[in-house]
């Protein structure tokens, strides 16, 4: 009986530390500001590092600019997004700006985006400062399902801080689906 | 059989449950704002209450000004900042402010800081209104090894609010490191 | 001996299965436009949706304008809440703004209110501007026992943005109370 | 594909009036600063007019400057330069560009239109 | 306004040939600078932008170089299809000048 035991308890252990690590995907990915669009209006960023600094990702897939979820469950969802601009840079095309982020939602299978949350300030940066800086920051608690794609939106992308610490998004699951 | 059976059962409710507990460590810090800095230059804030109103922590150790990691693991990382000024404090030295938080990471093995996360904004701060404000809020998940260390830089810290509710920050374990 | 350690591995994972979905309470409830107090002042939202879009709740109760707490434990609490104008929408009374968001706890028991965390900004929206918005974002980790309500306090609630993915606040159950 | 398309011009008589127009495509067009520049016949080119992607901000080169007037319809995707008070010197055709920064100023013009010419003669 | 002076106006080179041109700001423009191609009855064709980035699907040949007053386009081996002409194009405060133009032809 103390055999079997051991074994109900070892093969336990192994269930449980092994549903535990499996149930609890999560990923943290940092702005690649190598390819960062220069537009000024609402364009998805598809460069994110995965695996460098404090880049990273576990069962969950970044693909095609899309943090891809690869388990059902629900998910504390977070973004966080610094715009900056420096008077070296040059001169700003307008003074009023609308820095903006949205974190949206795609499904595959009915082929639809919806945004989850969104954030972000008016802004009037003048010419007045050599150096001006606004962080956004957005999260909060989702149900996501197998295949369903989470990507980020902006505004004034070219106005992104390319730091780790600054321009990041992320998510980790907290529980299953009933 | 039974009795074997009760004893299994008893003892992984036993495990389950010290597991589950050892395996979250948590804290949430609020400022001290009897020795907050004076200037308006960026600097480490040391003085918060780990016991008292919101405060609180576990599996954690709060020392030095610095919140001591006790256990490897995956942990969510926050904090909320806000800054004040009325004109009743007395004029501004400048109207213009960087008002900035860092999240920084110190590892002791190898004597080093890193910044996990920032936000925060420039603001115009006129004398035209006699109440100012701004909150900033930042949060990320990092993976933490036991005797690193999470500490909060602030720029202008003479403006920090010093209400439990308004500048806080903190951490929860939410996964074991595979 | 097979069969009993079946039933073991069985009433275990039942047992796992039901103490982590009981242990999990979570609520992310999205703001309900029809019905936004009107002024300037501070008031508690009493109207948020709990079962359309994203909004969703599970072991927790949604009643009289607060979310309730039904099994005690330590949560992670958060809120997003977005306002905005546009010239459109008329003249402001004033300019100068203070846009704020209280995350408040109450106790039945002890009939009393406490904030928890509080977040915003004043602003300047002048009418150089056609359109403005901003965006408050704040987060923590709190101790809640069954039977307290948390609720949401804004300032200027006309200007609030009524989208679901701009005005939420929520909570999710990280672990148990020691 | 990305493109501009030019349409308007003509021939007018001194102190007439015309009104440019540039279609775009293939592009976000609100979220682009676009200018004006015409070239003279036989001569170099010369800077006309710029407008901010949102329109707020609007520059003009000294020699235009109370007399045209640029504006732009994000709806439509269109930009436009209205000419009031025409010279024989502005005599030219005119080239729609776009700023190669949606945000800042000074990285220079990426894609043109085809021209149109505008002939002020009595 | 910032005048801006191109030299030479005409410039005579062979296929193979490497190529020089300068553009000269009255005052200090810092980095704005553009260059442009342009063939006869065409739109101009941006090159270079912020005085040494090169557009995009733009051949390697060409670059730039310079900053504050005194900027160079550099075609490294000329090609038949380079005969054209090169403008330098400044941006500062709120301001946009061509320069006259440098028409490289057929020695």
């Known amino acids: 009986i103390r055999a079997e035991k051991a074994m109900v308890d070892g093969s336990w252990l192994d269930l449980a530390k092994r549903s535990k690590l499996e149930a609890q995907p999560f990923a943290h990915l940092t702005i690649n500001a190598t390819d960062i669009p220069s537009g000024s209006h609402k364009v998805s960023l598809s460069s994110w590092y995965h695996d460098r600094g404090w880049a990273k990702i576990s069962n969950m897939t970044f693909s095609n600019g899309k943090l891809i979820v690869n388990q059902d469950g629900f998910y504390y969802l977070y973004a966080n997004i610094c715009f900056r601009h420096h008077e070296t840079s040059g001169d700003l095309a307008t003074e009023y700006l609308q820095l903006m982020v949205y974190v949206t939602k795609t499904s595959i299978k009915i082929p639809s985006s919806h945004t989850l949350m969104k954030g972000g300030s008016t802004k009037y940066w003048s010419g007045n400062s050599e150096f001006h800086f606004y962080s956004i920051n957005v999260g909060g608690f989702f149900k996501l399902r197998s295949g369903e794609e989470i990507s980020i939106e902006v505004s004034n992308p070219s106005l992104l801080d390319p730091d780790q610490d600054a321009t990041y998004f992320g998510a980790f699951k907290v529980r299953d689906i009933d | 059989i039974r009795a074997e059976k009760a004893m299994v059962d008893g003892s992984w409710l036993d495990l389950a449950k010290r597991s589950k507990l050892e395996a979250q460590p948590f804290a949430h810090l609020t400022i001290n704002a009897t020795d907050i800095p004076s200037g308006s230059h960026k600097v480490s804030l040391s003085s918060w209450y780990h016991d008292r109103g919101w405060a609180k922590i576990s599996n954690m150790t709060f020392s030095n000004g610095k919140l001591i990691v006790n256990q490897d693991g995956f942990y969510y990382l926050y904090a909320n900042i806000c800054f004040r000024h009325h004109e009743t404090s007395g004029d501004l030295a400048t109207e213009y402010l960087q008002l900035m938080v860092y999240v920084t990471k110190t590892s002791i093995k190898i004597p080093s800081s890193h910044t996990l996360m920032k936000g925060g904004s420039t603001k115009y701060w006129s004398g035209n209104s006699e109440f100012h404000f701004y909150s900033i809020n930042v949060g990320g998940f990092f993976k933490l090894r036991s005797g690193e260390e999470i500490s909060i830089e602030v720029s202008n810290p003479s403006l920090l609010d010093p209400d439990q509710d308004a500048t806080y920050f903190g951490a929860f374990k939410v996964r074991d490191i595979d | 001996i097979r069969a009993e350690k079946a039933m073991v591995d069985g009433s275990w994972l039942d047992l796992a299965k039901r103490s982590k979905l009981e242990a999990q309470p979570f609520a992310h409830l999205t703001i309900n436009a029809t019905d936004i107090p009107s002024g300037s002042h501070k008031v508690s939202l009493s109207s948020w949706y709990h079962d359309r879009g994203w909004a969703k709740i599970s072991n927790m109760t949604f009643s009289n304008g607060k979310l309730i707490v039904n099994q005690d434990g330590f949560y992670y609490l958060y809120a997003n809440i977005c306002f905005r104008h546009h010239e459109t929408s008329g003249d402001l009374a004033t300019e100068y703004l203070q846009l704020m968001v209280y995350v408040t706890k109450t106790s039945i028991k002890i009939p009393s209110s406490h904030t928890l965390m509080k977040g915003g900004s004043t602003k300047y929206w002048s009418g150089n501007s056609e359109f403005h918005f901003y965006s408050i974002n704040v987060g923590g980790f709190f101790k809640l026992r069954s039977g307290e309500e948390i609720s949401i306090e804004v300032s200027n609630p006309s200007l609030l943005d009524p989208d679901q993915d701009a005005t939420y606040f929520g909570a999710f159950k990280v672990r148990d109370i020691d | 594909q990305v493109q501009l398309v030019q349409s308007g011009g003509g021939v007018v008589h001194p102190g007439r009036s015309l009104r440019l127009s540039c279609a775009a495509s293939g592009f976000t067009f609100s979220g682009y600063g676009m200018h004006w520049v015409r070239q003279a016949p036989g001569k170099g080119l010369e800077w006309v007019a710029v407008i901010s992607y949102d329109g707020t901000n609007k520059y003009y080169a000294d020699s235009v400057k109370g007399r045209f007037t640029i504006s732009r319809d994000n709806s439509k995707d269109t930009l436009y330069l209205q000419m009031n008070s025409l010279r024989p010197e502005d005599t030219a055709v005119y080239y729609c560009a776009k700023c190669l920064s949606g945000t800042y100023w000074g990285y220079g013009m990426d894609v043109w239109g085809q021209g149109t010419t505008v002939t002020v003669s009595s | 306004d910032i005048q801006m002076t191109q030299s030479p106006s005409t410039l005579s080179a062979s296929v193979g040939d490497r190529v020089t041109i300068t553009c000269r700001a009255s005052q200090s423009i810092s980095s704005w600078l553009a260059w442009y191609q342009q063939k006869p009855g065409k739109a101009p064709k941006l090159l270079i932008y912020k005085a040494s980035s090169l557009e995009s699907g733009v051949p390697s040949r060409f670059s730039g170089s310079g900053s504050g007053t005194e900027f160079t386009l550099t075609i490294s081996s000329l090609q038949p299809d380079d005969f054209a002409t090169y403008y330098c194009?400044?941006?500062?405060?709120?301001?946009?000048?061509f320069g006259q133009g440098t028409k490289v032809e057929i020695k």
């Open positions: 194009q400044q941006y500062n405060s709120y301001s946009w000048t």
